[in-house]
Interface confidence: medium
């Protein structure tokens, strides 16, 4: 049952072979030295690879994972806040370091960096007011969230704020901009002729990353942004507010950073680690910082701003939320209130602060220079009941299980690295700085990265985003795992997942999504080209159309939220541990890497068809400027044929020959790397993957052939169409070349 994929009965020797096995070869003189070395290597590898301990297989690893342990770890990680850059989070880093050592990892080190973080001023709180014609504040938004029951006396709960907002006290008329998406500003500016210049805009959270909202508002000329959680997006009908249910109360507020880093990491040291001898940019040259004040509020406060709005009516029903207000767009207040203005009071500061990653190593027995990485962040906005500690607790249990096997004498074939990242909430800083520091090792040795942030965002079904190389791994693994879902007793996870979340393209298969960003896999996948994946339990997107989960980044994201409402038995957490841990086990232990390059061929064709159909919305321009996709389709066809032949060779080659095995595995490992363009995407040098990038309009979403997509976006509005279509042609060229070049890495080497 556990013999998944290729030859994955791959437990290796319980200890390294004695060195004397290959010592005899060294007596061969001079010209025979290399032959002797290889001979010794052959003996070592084949012995180790065939010395299988049945006790130490995938099943043993998975059976060791316990829901009760995950529950205990979650409780332990969520009793106080662990904000990045604070003493509490440093202490948790040291605790995790100590426990991972106890669990049996070979080494566990702290990796520290000094990065730009952002905090509210403790004596000068941030708030928004309505002011009358005399400048008197007649209404002020709340300064903090009412703490949940049992947490009233907890200190160091950071009040709601938008991290990296500049200081400022702008005042002006309000304009309601819906979700502040690109299309929302198009509607306002182009259709409704509403000018946001010099206005304070109010936008509802949801649909897209908050940093994109702020960028869009800046480009529209706004002088401040108010973000709020509308019940339409964060209050599921029929569910009570916390603490009686999992809905957002009116005083609850979503924290979060509002950067537009585009993969840069620390804003002051883009491309390089923020170490002791780093050269730091001045704040004016820092990457991705917003230029206008931004502040988040809850729907109690939002109602008091929105109910007075005048000006234009909402353009259509998609602009109306669920508050009992008119959702007028403005600008400004109506009738009696037209002389009143909105004023922001923002006093947060940006500070270079030390952060700490925890890096644990379990050395591989056969290929110690091949790294499989499992990483998730540790820092939270407040208690982190879901984000991140539901993920960190799962990582902790996975480490414990691997450690248990290691203490019994087992080792994985390849090295496994475990990471507890810091400062993810401030822009993926811990993971990015570590990857910048270790980029040369990672690009040569990185096999795969599995992300482990929040294990749950619902309790309906599995959700997986990954490289196409991992599709078959995920399918085969989930077919072997039991579903935790009610009504699927005795059925596989694959079956419940496929039933609840079917693929839109392939019947009988589950949906697997593209990787976007907004989490710690970004630097590994989008910058370095290391095959990556993530898995968590999610909500029913059909019936729950709210964005994320209602209590995301609020003070109400507690242990009790998870234990009472999401996963009382921790069975969904256990399933996620099995998926994440199972993927790591297979990636680190299978003799042949569990990557199927044919799945990349399939999606490349799909993505080429999609981008071609977008381009064909402009048939006249395509003809006028001689735009052809022939080169791209030809490259995809070549990739498909070469991938097919490679897969045939993969079935047939002599797996007892370690040189050939290593060669084939390297071709698989380096395929993802082959999609990296060293020059990066236009204006986004750290997004270097040609097939996937975070959407320019929503960091959370993945876009395929992003260079071509962005060149085509809104092309009809470009001032110089000849130049614009020239860029489309250039991007088609880059994409076609990259696909062809990647294909050739799979060809026979000589």
């Amino acid at each position: 049952m556990w013999n998944l994929l290729h030859e994955t009965d791959s437990a290796v020797a319980t200890a390294r072979r004695p060195r004397w096995l290959c010592a005899g070869a060294l007596v061969l003189a001079g010209g025979f030295f290399l032959l002797g070395f290889l001979f010794g290597w052959f003996i070592k590898s084949s012995n180790e690879a065939t010395n299988i301990t049945p006790k130490h297989n995938m099943k043993a690893f998975l059976d060791e994972l316990k829901a009760e342990n995950i529950k205990k770890f979650l409780y332990n990680f969520t009793q106080i806040p662990h904000l990045a850059g604070t003493e509490q989070n440093f202490q948790l880093a040291k605790q995790i370091q100590s426990q991972w050592k106890e669990f049996g990892l070979d080494s566990v080190e702290l990796a520290h960096y000094d990065v730009l973080l952002s905090y509210p001023n403790k004596t000068h709180p941030n708030y928004i007011s309505i002011i009358n014609e005399d400048g008197n504040e007649i209404f002020n938004t709340s300064l903090f969230e009412p703490p949940p029951p049992g947490y009233e006396n907890v200190s160091d709960i950071v009040p709601p704020f938008s991290a990296f907002s500049p200081q400022g006290m702008p005042e002006g008329d309000l304009v309601y901009v819906n979700y502040a998406r690109t299309e929302d500003f198009f509607k306002l500016e182009r259709d409704m002729k509403i000018n946001c210049s010099g206005k304070i805009v109010i936008a509802r959270y949801g649909k897209v990353f908050r940093g994109n909202k702020v960028k869009n508002a800046q480009l529209a000329g706004a002088k401040g942004v108010i973000l709020y959680s509308d019940p339409a997006d964060y209050f599921a009908p029929g569910v009570k507010s916390y603490p009686d249910g999992w809905n957002l109360p009116g005083g609850g507020v979503q924290r979060g950073n509002i950067l537009n880093l585009n993969g840069a990491g620390d804003p002051l040291t883009p491309g390089y680690p923020a170490n002791e001898y780093a050269y730091r940019r001045g704040i004016a040259e820092a990457v991705g910082l917003p230029s206008i004040p931004v502040h988040p509020i809850g729907y109690y406060d939002a109602q008091k701003l929105l109910e007075k709005m005048g000006g234009s009516a909402p353009p259509d029903s998609s602009w109306r939320g669920s508050l009992k207000v008119p959702y007028n767009v403005g600008p400004g207040f109506t009738g009696n209130f037209s002389t009143q203005k909105v004023k922001m009071h923002i006093h947060s500061t940006n500070e270079v602060t030390r952060i700490y990653n925890v890096i644990g190593t379990l050395r591989g027995a056969v290929e110690p220079d091949r790294y499989v990485i499992l990483g998730g962040h540790r820092d939270s906005w407040v208690f982190g009941g879901i984000d991140p500690q539901s993920g960190a607790a799962v990582v902790h249990e996975i480490v414990r299980s691997f450690g248990t096997l290691k203490k019994e004498g087992w080792r994985p074939r390849r090295t496994i690295l475990f990471a507890s990242w810091d400062a993810e909430e401030f822009g993926l800083l811990g993971s990015t700085e570590w990857a910048e520091e270790n980029s040369r090792l990672l690009q040569e040795r990185g096999v795969a990265y599995i992300n482990a942030d929040s294990s749950i965002e619902g309790n309906y079904t599995l959700r997986v985003d990954c490289t196409p190389l991992m599709y078959s791994l995920v399918h085969n693994l989930t077919k072997e795992l039991k579903s935790p879902d009610e009504g699927f007793e005795g059925k596989s996870l694959y079956e419940s997942w496929t039933k609840k979340s079917p693929s839109p393209e392939f019947s009988g298969m589950p949906r697997i999504s593209k990787l976007g960003s907004g989490n710690d896999f970004e630097v590994f996948f989008q910058r370095l080209g290391i095959a990556s994946g993530r898995a968590r339990y999610t909500k029913n997107w059909e019936t729950n159309k709210f964005s994320g989960y209602p209590l995301y980044h609020s003070v109400y994201e507690t242990y009790e939220l998870v234990e009472k409402f999401y996963d009382p038995m921790f069975k969904y957490h256990l399933t996620v541990a099995q998926v994440r841990g199972g993927m790591v086990f297979e990636l680190a232990n299978s003799i042949v890497l569990p990557f199927d390059c044919r799945d990349y061929a399939v999606v490349l064709r799909k993505y080429a068809d999609k981008i071609y159909s977008i381009s064909m919305k402009h048939p006249q321009e395509m003809k006028t400027y001689s735009v052809s996709f022939d080169s791209l389709f030809s490259a995809v066809k070549n990739f498909t044929e070469i991938a097919s032949k490679f897969s045939e060779r993969l079935q047939d080659f002599d797996k007892s020959n370690p040189i050939v095995l290593r060669m084939m595995n390297d071709q698989l490992m380096f395929l993802e790397r082959a999609f990296i363009d060293p020059l990066g995407l236009p204006d986004r040098p750290f997004y270097r993957h040609v097939i996937y990038a975070p959407s320019s309009h929503n960091k959370y979403a993945g876009e395929s052939f992003p260079g071509i997509y962005d060149a085509l976006f809104d092309i009809e509005s470009k001032v110089d169409p000849s130049k614009a279509w020239g860029e489309v042609k250039r991007q088609i060229y880059v994409a076609a070349f990259t696909v062809q070049a990647a294909a050739e890495t799979l060809s026979e080497v000589a």
Epitope: I138, P231, F235, G250, G251, Y300, D301, E307, K324
Partner: nanobody, 119 residues
Framework: EVQLVESGGGLVQPGGSLRLSCAAS????????MYWVRQAPGKGLEWVAN????????YYVDSVKGRFTISRDNAKNSLYLQMNSLRAEDTAVYYC????????????WGQGTLVTVSS
């Protein structure tokens, strides 16, 4: 748990006055519009008055305009209805009600206090 408790009802002669109070708990009182609603014997519910969260906007049914005054004290989580020049047709059970902020969410009602106007 949301709770609304009315008090101040009783028997009063025509032309007399009463002041109804409503003590609110279990929610952020200052964030909600509040209402007084009444139900006369054998009749349906009738909206009487409502007030916005800050107390700056007040609305009344025509039959009570100039006689009734709705007010609130957010510091005390309390809603009031000052009823002057009472008439026999004002006899009813008076309910304090909290609007929902959210479309489709149910409102909350108190148990009511009986006002009887009779000589």
């Amino acid at each position: 748990e949301v709770q609304l408790v009315e008090s101040g009802g009783g028997l009063v002669q025509p032309g007399g006055s009463l002041r109804l109070s409503c003590a609110a708990s279990g929610f952020t009182f200052s964030s909600y519009w509040m209402y007084w609603v009444r139900q006369a014997p054998g009749k349906g519910l009738e909206w009487v008055a409502n007030i916005n969260h800050g107390g700056s906007e007040k609305y009344y049914v025509d039959s009570v305009k100039g006689r009734f005054t709705i007010s609130r004290d957010n510091a005390k989580n309390s809603l009031y209805l000052q009823m002057n020049s009472l008439r026999a047709e004002d006899t009813a059970v008076y309910y304090c009600a909290r609007d929902s902020l959210i479309v489709g969410e149910r409102g909350y009602w108190g148990q009511g206090t009986l006002v009887t106007v009779s000589s």
